[in-house]
């Protein structure tokens, strides 16, 4: 029950996270005009990954897409790439995790396959979340750098009298959405990986009990991890080093390919 809850919650959290990553990627407010220490402007500028917009006091908003690809800064291209990779991985992860959900029955799919799929989606969510966090952080760093560069020469005097105010940009709402969404996707992925450990059948359908002797004992258990390779079943015996007697009802903590989570 706890495993199903963990898996379900992981899926929901990841779903919200990926929706947030998509929203952040599409949002226009990645950077917004810094209004601090500025004259009260009737023209408000903000920029996204795909277009820049201007909102006027009249209520009119005009957006222009970045129709060039080669003319854009490499950093912006990198951010775009990271966000898209994050979305693609997240979407695939969601697709895989739907079939991996314990509460959904698909034919005669074994628990081992579901465990494998849960782990795969979990890893995908983790990478997706990291991509989003990295993308947003790279953009934020770019903003901070540009902000201080423009602050250094914000007022460039022309003949002493005329001033040119350089537009400075600060963090937009999309950055915060991206950070939160990336974090949620990451958390969801971790939860899926945790759920995977509980999903993996450690035993065959009878309870195997290992007894420990006074010396350093080796207990052989028939039908170890079925989910050890690929999506197929694995009936090879696995050598387990254990100090006490346990049943498959108890939490297992034997070294396995799932233990790095």
């Amino acid at each position: 029950m706890a495993v199903t809850a963990c898996q379900g919650l992981g899926f929901v959290v990841s779903l919200i996270g990926i929706a947030g990553i998509i929203a952040a990627t599409c949002m226009d407010q990645w950077s917004t005009q810094d209004l601090y220490n500025n004259p009260v402007t009737a023209v408000f500028n903000y920029q996204g990954l795909w277009r820049s917009c201007v909102r006027e006091s009249s209520g009119f908003t005009e957006c222009r897409g970045y129709f060039t690809l080669l003319g854009l800064p490499a950093m912006l291209q990198a951010v775009r790439a990271l966000m898209i990779v994050g979305i693609v991985l997240g979407a695939i992860g969601l697709l895989v995790s739907i079939f991996a959900l314990k509460c959904i029955r698909i034919g005669s799919m074994e628990d081992s396959a579901k465990a494998n799929m849960t782990l795969t989606s979990g890893i995908m969510f983790i990478v997706s979340g990291l991509c989003a966090i990295a993308g947003v952080s790279v953009f934020a760093n770019m903003l901070v750098t540009n902000f201080w560069m423009s602050t250094a020469n914000m007022y460039t005097g022309m003949g002493g009298m005329v001033q040119t105010v350089q537009t400075r940009y600060t963090f937009g709402a999309a950055l915060f959405v991206g950070w939160v969404a990336g974090g949620l996707t990451l958390i969801g992925g971790v939860m899926m990986c945790i759920a995977c450990r509980g999903l993996a059948p450690e035993e065959t359908n009878y309870k195997a009990v290992s007894y420990h002797a006074s010396g350093h004992s080796v207990a052989y258990k028939p039908g170890g991890f079925k989910a050890s390779t690929g999506f197929g079943s694995n009936t090879k015996n696995k050598k387990i080093y254990d100090g006490g007697a346990r049943t498959e009802d108890e939490v297992q903590s034997y070294p396995s390919k799932h233990d790095y989570v």
Partner: antibody
């Protein structure tokens, strides 16, 4: 046809109050940013206040705290409540509309209402 | 506040003449976000409210004759009337519509 009709002007003593109204017709009033502009006896134009669609309000520094701009979209009316009036507030007050695609420029003006502050 | 300086203050012209008036702002009215200048020109005839002629420094308002041309960028702007007609005799004002307060120039009076 777009029409802006101001009313409420008159003669008032210094320190007195007056409320100007501007009735808009021929356009969707709630979709436009509205402003008050005054023309002094010396024929200088002076922007007074602006109220945006999102009800952001901006005032000329010399009228801040004394004048209040407001709008009633249901009645298609713009208001300017003027308190603590001074002699320098004497002017012809125009109600203006900021055009949606005119880069914040005022595309329509009323005929104006005269305000005289004198003892 | 942004100071708008118009010159000359008055201009005596004959019909058919080309007229140029200038407007200088104390701060750039150019917006890098959309590469537009936020300056408007108005015409005020005696006994009438001002009428919008030019917005965005160079775009003619609909219904405005093409003899009126706005130009300039940043801080220096110009209004040109290619061939003055009798009905053009009025006061012309420039206005900053980029920053609050929306300041006007003192005006240029066009007279015969």
């Amino acid at each position: 046809e777009v029409k802006l009709v101001e009313s409420g002007g008159g003669l008032v003593k210094p320190g007195g109050s007056l409320k100007l109204s501007c009735a808009g017709s021929g356009f969707t009033f709630s979709s436009y940013t509205m402003s008050w502009v005054r023309q002094t006896p010396e024929k200088r134009l002076e922007w007074v206040a602006t109220i945006t669609i999102g009800v952001n309000i901006y005032y000329l520094d010399s009228v801040k705290g004394r004048f209040t701009i407001s709008r009633d979209n249901a009645k298609n009316t713009l208001y300017l409540q003027m308190n603590s009036l001074r002699s320098e507030d004497t002017a012809l007050y125009y109600c203006t509309r900021l055009g949606q695609t005119q880069r914040n420029a005022m595309d329509y003006w009323g005929q104006g209402t005269s305000v005289t502050v004198s003892s | 506040d942004i100071v708008m300086t118009q010159s000359p203050t008055s201009l005596s012209v004959s019909a058919g003449e080309k007229v140029t008036m200038t407007c200088k702002s104390s701060q750039s009215l150019f917006n890098s976000g959309n590469q537009k200048n936020y300056l408007a020109w108005y015409q005020e005839k005696p006994g009438q409210p001002p009428k919008l002629l030019i917005y965005g420094a160079s775009t003619r308002e609909s219904g405005v004759p093409d003899r009126f041309t706005g130009s300039g960028s940043g801080t220096d702007f110009t209004l040109t009337i290619s061939s003055v007609q009798a009905e053009d005799l009025a006061v012309y004002y420039c206005q900053n519509v980029h920053f609050y307060p929306f300041t006007f120039g003192a005006g240029t009076k066009l007279e015969l």
